[in-house]
């Protein structure tokens, strides 16, 4: 059947930044300026993404592809496709409604963009905080109390080697 | 799948209170600002607070400013509404809606919303 | 506050005809900040469009929106039967409440 149908539609043929003119008799045009059809058989192209505004073009629109969009400096992209530019903010802060607000205390933010995390609980792994977290950076944690205690050794056996990107097994 | 359920709701009389919940799964509740929304019986929508990922910023409509509070807590996957002082014109449904992007705290549309409660405040 | 204000209240059209909705905000919003979304009966709002013209997931082809500045627009290409509902604008713009459209009816005719 699908066979039948692509010898019966002209449109099938097509090809990709063209499409099929119904006013020209079913005959494949090129795509007009600033739009385009990336599969073939369509019967209209669709209008090429216009970076404007804090957007900026990281790829221009072709007959086969549409633009691809990024932002402008101080903003960065969020969602699929860049779809909206969220304004920076430093180190140790983050977008809210109100503007940028500096992380609270016991979270961090070691970007300029996205938000403000809790410090790891090194006590959860059993071990101790060597080094304060700060509103940029997170807390550095070190061995646990017990491994300081005198007499005992700080050096942990080395764990086994493991090559990177595999899962043990 | 995405799902938020919120529970909690009920009949309470004017200056009581009530605590409402939104339990979520189906995706990484920390990374998302969340929202409460409500809608009076055959009326429209009305945004009432959100809170940032781990809950450093709030924001409140001002018609609850100071009678309600939002929380979460993101080992539970669950958010919270404190109704305090409760009004007569609270009487909603209230929803709990999922923040459009992820990993921003900055308060943006929803694109996930559960199915809803009912507040009735009434004597 | 933004207030936010749709036309019409109330549109009759029949199946297969346009709808065209309109949003007008009391200040200039960034394009980036508008959203509509669908609600019917006994339902959750939908998210249709966000970013004035980015169609959500899953959202047909035939909902469309446009517009910058005080002036919004979706536009139904098509009516189906299950498009018939309320449909809402909201404003998520910078230091500003979120606020909702008071809503706009599209009936059967």
């Known amino acids: 059947f699908e066979r039948t149908r692509s010898l019966q539609d002209p449109c099938s043929n097509c090809p990709a930044g063209t499409f099929c003119d119904n006013n020209r008799n079913q005959i494949c045009s090129p795509c007009p300026p600033n739009s385009f059809s990336s599969a073939g058989g369509q019967r209209t192209c669709d209008i090429c993404r216009q970076c404007k505004g804090v957007f900026r073009t990281r790829k221009e629109c072709s007959s086969t592809s549409n633009a691809e969009c990024d932002c402008t400096p101080g903003f960065h992209c969020l969602g699929a496709g860049c779809s909206m530019c969220e304004q920076d903010c430093k180190q140790g802060q983050e977008l809210t409604k109100k503007g940028c607000k500096d992380c609270c205390f016991g979270t961090f933010n070691d970007q300029k963009r996205g938000i403000c995390r809790p410090w790891t609980n090194c006590s959860l792994d059993g071990k101790s905080v060597l080094v304060n977290g700060t509103k940029e950076r997170d807390v550095v944690c070190g061995p646990s109390p017990a491994d300081l205690s005198p007499g005992a050794s700080s050096v942990t056996p080395p764990a086994p080697a493991r090559e990177p990107g595999h899962s043990p097994q | 799948e995405v799902q938020l359920l919120e529970s909690g709701g009920g009949l309470v009389q004017p200056g009581g209170s009530l605590r409402l919940s939104c339990a979520a799964s189906g995706f990484t509740f920390s990374a998302y600002n969340i929202h409460w929304v409500r809608q009076a019986p055959g009326k429209g929508l009305e945004w009432v607070s959100d809170?940032?990922?781990?809950?450093?910023?709030?924001n409140y409509a001002d018609s609850v400013k100071g009678r309600f509070t939002i929380s979460r807590d993101n080992s539970k996957n669950t958010l919270y509404l404190q109704m305090n002082s409760l009004r007569a014109e609270d009487t909603a449904v209230y929803y709990c809606a999922r923040n459009l992007y992820e990993l921003s705290a900055y308060s943006y549309g929803a694109d996930y919303w559960g199915q809803g409660t009912l507040v009735t405040v009434s004597s | 506050e933004i207030v936010l204000t749709q036309s019409p209240g109330t549109l009759s059209l029949s199946p297969g005809e346009r709808a065209t909705l309109s949003c007008r905000a009391s200040q200039s919003v960034s394009s980036s900040y508008l959203a509509w979304y669908q609600q019917k009966p006994g339902q959750a709002p939908r998210l249709l469009i966000y970013g004035a013209s980015s169609r959500a997931t899953g959202i047909p082809d035939r909902f469309s929106g446009s517009g910058s500045g005080t002036d919004f627009t979706l536009t139904i290409s098509r009516l189906e039967p299950e498009d018939f509902a309320v449909y809402y604008c909201?404003?998520?713009?910078?230091?500003?409440?979120?606020?909702f459209g008071q809503g706009t009816k599209v009936e059967i005719k």
């Open positions: 809170i940032s990922p781990y809950g450093g910023a709030t």
């Open positions: 909201q404003q998520y713009y910078y230091s500003s409440p979120i606020t």
